[in-house]
C-alpha cells in the first residue's frame, strides 16, 4: 500500500509493487533528458555483493503537460521515471531494458520510486472563470528493492535508512479508473 500513489486522474500511473514503467519513447518530441541520472555510483566488488551502494537505479527525466478534462497545465512539469532493472553500478548496461544479466539464482532487483513530491499546477480551461489548480504527485527519486527468488512481490526488501520507518506521505491510489481518465493520461504524456 505504501507504494501506491494518491489519485492523479490525468497523470502517469506511479508504479505499484509489481508494476514497472516502460521508459518513455526515445527522444519523442525532444523532451527526454538526462538519461542516466543516477547510474554513476562507483563500483567496488563483484556483482554478488550485498552492499547497497553496489546497486544502481536509472532515473529518467522528461517533461509533459498535465491534462485534466478539457484543461491543460499552463506550463509543463518535469517528471522522473525509474527504469526497470537494477544491478551493480559497474555492470549497468548503457542501454535500458536488456533484461536480467546477473546470475539467475541470485536476488532480483527492481528500480522503483523512493520519494515523491507534489507540484501545484495552474490549469488553463476553455472559458472557465474560476482559477483552477491541481496537485500532481511526481516521483522525486528512485531506489532499488530486492526480491529474492520464491518470494512474492509483497516481500520486497527495502535498502537504505528509510526501510525500517513507516512511510509518511505515501498516498493510496485507487486500483481502477475511468476510461476517460486513462485516455487523458495518454494525451500529452510525453
Amino acid at each position: 500500500q505504501g507504494w501506491q500513489a494518491f489519485k492523479n486522474d490525468a497523470t502517469e500511473i506511479i508504479p505499484e509493487l509489481g508494476e514497472y514503467p516502460e521508459p518513455p519513447p526515445e527522444l519523442e518530441n525532444n523532451k527526454t533528458m538526462n538519461r542516466a541520472e543516477n547510474g554513476g555510483r562507483p563500483p567496488h566488488h563483484p556483482f554478488e555483493t550485498k552492499d547497497v551502494s553496489e546497486y544502481s537505479c536509472r532515473e529518467l527525466h522528461f517533461t509533459r503537460y498535465v491534462t485534466d478534462g478539457q484543461c491543460r497545465s499552463a506550463k509543463p512539469v518535469t517528471e522522473l521515471v525509474c527504469s526497470g532493472q537494477c544491478g551493480p553500478a559497474r555492470l549497468l548496461p548503457n542501454a535500458i531494458g536488456r533484461g536480467k544479466w546477473w546470475r539467475p539464482s541470485g536476488p532480483d532487483f527492481r528500480c522503483i520510486p523512493d520519494r515523491y513530491r507534489a507540484q501545484r499546477v495552474q490549469l488553463l480551461c476553455p472559458g472557465g472563470a474560476a482559477p483552477r489548480a491541481r496537485k500532481v504527485r511526481l516521483v522525486a527519486s528512485c531506489k532499488c528493492k530486492r526480491l529474492t527468488r520464491f518470494h512474492n512481490q509483497s516481500e520486497l526488501k527495502d535498502f537504505g535508512p528509510e526501510a525500517a520507518r513507516p512511510q509518511k506521505g505515501r498516498k493510496p491510489r485507487p486500483r481502477a479508473r475511468g476510461a476517460k481518465a486513462n485516455q487523458a493520461e495518454l494525451e500529452n504524456a510525453y
Partner: antibody, heavy 118, light 107 residues
C-alpha cells in the same frame, strides 16, 4: 487508506466563533487541497472555500468572506476551519473534504454538527 | 453565482429499474460537473467528475453525460445500496455550487 477525522459536535451562542478540526491520515496534507462544505439540517450542500496547505493559499466563497478562516498545522496533518459571528442560520453539519484539485471533493470527513442557539 | 437545478427532487423506483437524474446549470459550465451520492447521516461520496468520468471504485452501472448546461446521471440497474440522495456540483466558476439534490426512494 485515506481518512479524514473531524472534531466533535459543538453548541455555540449567536455572535460566538467555532473552530472545527480535520485530522487527515493516509497521505500528506500538503499534497492536496482542503475544502470545507456545510449542510444545514434537511438541506443541500454549500461550498465554503478551499485552502492549499502547502503555501497557505485560500479561496473563500464570497458569502463567507470576512467570517471564515481556513488554516492548517502541517506538522500534525490537521486542517482547521473557523467561522465567526455565528448566527442561527449557521447551524449545520460542517464537512472537510480533500482532493488533488480545487474544484472537486474526493474524500470527505464524517462531518461536525455545529448548533447555534441562544 | 451559477444556479444548479436538479430534477426531479425525489423519485420512487424499484430494484433493477433504470433511473435518470438531470441537472441544469444557469449558464454554461463546459464539462466541469461532478455527481455525489449521500446516504442519511453520512458524508457525500464522489461518483463522477468531468461530467462523465467514473470515480475509481464506483460501480459501472453509474454513468454521466452532458456538457454546457444540461447534464444527466444514469443508474442503469438500481441496486438496494443505491437508495440515497444525489447531488450535482459545478466546478467551473467560483463559488462552486451544488444542485438541490434528488432523493431516490424505494417504491
Amino acid at each position: 487508506q485515506v481518512q479524514l477525522v473531524q472534531s466533535g459536535a459543538e453548541v455555540k451562542k449567536p455572535g460566538a466563533s467555532v473552530k472545527v478540526s480535520c485530522k487527515v491520515s493516509g497521505y500528506t496534507l500538503t499534497h492536496t487541497f482542503m475544502h470545507w462544505v456545510r449542510q444545514a439540517p434537511g438541506k443541500g450542500l454549500e461550498w465554503m472555500g478551499w485552502s492549499d496547505p502547502e503555501i497557505g493559499d485560500t479561496e473563500y466563497a464570497s458569502k463567507f468572506q470576512g467570517r471564515v478562516t481556513m488554516t492548517e498545522d502541517t506538522s500534525t496533518d490537521t486542517a482547521y476551519m473557523e467561522l465567526s459571528s455565528l448566527r442561527s442560520e449557521d447551524t449545520a453539519v460542517y464537512y472537510c473534504a480533500t482532493g488533488d484539485t480545487t474544484y472537486k471533493f474526493d474524500y470527505w470527513g464524517q462531518g461536525t454538527l455545529v448548533t447555534v442557539s441562544s | 453565482d451559477i444556479q444548479m437545478t436538479q430534477s426531479p427532487s425525489s423519485l420512487s423506483a424499484s430494484v433493477g429499474d433504470r433511473v435518470t437524474i438531470t441537472c441544469r446549470a444557469s449558464e454554461g459550465i463546459h464539462d466541469a460537473l461532478a455527481w455525489y451520492q449521500q446516504k442519511p447521516g453520512k458524508a457525500p461520496k464522489l461518483l463522477i467528475y468531468w461530467a462523465s468520468t467514473l470515480e475509481s471504485g464506483v460501480p459501472s452501472r453509474f454513468s454521466g453525460s452532458g456538457s454546457g448546461t444540461d447534464f444527466t446521471l444514469t443508474i442503469s440497474s438500481l441496486q438496494p445500496e443505491d437508495f440515497a440522495t444525489y447531488y450535482c456540483q459545478q466546478g467551473d466558476t467560483l463559488p462552486y455550487t451544488f444542485g438541490g439534490g434528488t432523493k431516490v426512494e424505494i417504491k
